[in-house]
Amino acid sequence: IINGSDCDMHTQPWQAALLLRPNQLYCGAVLVHPQWLLTAAHCRKKVFRVRLGHYSLSPVYESGQQMFQGVKSIPHPGYSHPGHSNDLMLIKLNRRIRPTKDVRPINVSSHCPSAGTKCLVSGWGTTKSPQVHFPKVLQCLNISVLSQKRCEDAYPRQIDDTMFCAGDKAGRDSCQGDSGGPVVCNGSLQGLVSWGDYPCARPNRPGVYTNLCKFTKWIQETIQANS
């Protein structure tokens, strides 16, 4: 997250970190069910661990943390690398979470976002770009949803209705390492960090997010079929 600020503790209990050994974060994710996460399809790895209820990036033990294995990864069938469409994936945890103030699922919004809607994006991704500098603790940033037309102007021929753009002033954006993390609008999960320009936070180059309102049926049906 570029030019965000430290999230208040306990305010993002659905935020998950996807880790490679040894405790190396490579993507964010979101708890949407007691045993299921959503993340970006481009975050797919064969073997990984999931950390929930953790505030700092470092592997230091925190009393609210819960650790899991990802036992099943189900990318959306419409996702095709290196395209950006349908960039979402469900991850089944090896067991159900223990609900606490630090670990709690969030509902996926069935309403599509309106231009101007204020949202919050969070993650442990780099705080500088093109340099790489990772934060000590989870970062939060207020962003506004942009119209599809503004999005199309910024990224011609690359935008479809499985994506939405959001941004703030130049110099504020999600970035590498935030992928798969949540965009929360009006208390519901509206999007996942998907892609954007490089370097991050360039003027008139907003972040692009997976438009989850288009996938509520697929999410529900996939969880039910694999539970």
């Epitope: 309403h111 599509c112 976002p113 309106s114 231009a115 101007g116 809607t117 949803v145 119209s147 599809q148 037309k149 503004r150 199309e152 102007d153 910024a154 011609p156 021929r157 935008i159 479809d160 209705d161 008139n204």
Partner: antibody
Framework: VKESEGGLFKPTDTLTLTCTVS????????ISWVRQAPGNGLEWIGY????????YYATWAESRSTITRNTNLNTVTLKMTSLTAADTATYFC?????????????WGPGTLVTVSS | AYDLTQTPASVEAAVGGTVTINCQAS??????LSWYQQKSGQPPKLLIY???TLASGVPSRFKGSGSGTDFTLTISDLECADAATYYC????????????FGGGTEVVVK
Amino acid sequence: VKESEGGLFKPTDTLTLTCTVSGFSLSSYPISWVRQAPGNGLEWIGYITSEYGVAYYATWAESRSTITRNTNLNTVTLKMTSLTAADTATYFCVRENPTYGYAYDAWGPGTLVTVSS
Amino acid sequence: AYDLTQTPASVEAAVGGTVTINCQASESIGNELSWYQQKSGQPPKLLIYQASTLASGVPSRFKGSGSGTDFTLTISDLECADAATYYCAQGFSSSGVENVFGGGTEVVVK
């Protein structure tokens, strides 16, 4: 913004209209083409983006319309192939204002295109 | 996608009266909606942009409201000069769009 002269065309002809702009940069404002058949409502044909000059079209117009621009000459061109009588209309070149939520804030006077055998 | 349905197709009101024109989007377009007035033989003129902001030189008798999918143009203290056709248009998306304009509403002033 001002459109070039329309005129009388035959079915199957190709229409080429040029819009000349002054007082602003095509790199800052998108340009749309809109048409209006006699006694009918406004019909959007397509537009060309400001920064990259990429064109988007209405679904009905996509297969036979091309919008291009020349930023040095301050012109935007609409080319429409395979004309039929249904293409008879007044064609407007319009400036879109991104600051105003892409409202159409400057309209040309329009040019009449008649398609008849 | 993002089709606009404008109602009514025609409305008649007396001088000094009020008319209300509705525009409904098939999907949420935030506040990216504008209103236009067109008189016979002339190009349309921008009245209101971003749902409720009055364009320069437009009298305050014209009022736009709404957001998301439902929008309204209200013309109060009607004058003879307000007799025209009014159109709404969306500026939210241009991909896979049939028409960005509503069908139009003819306002007749008695």
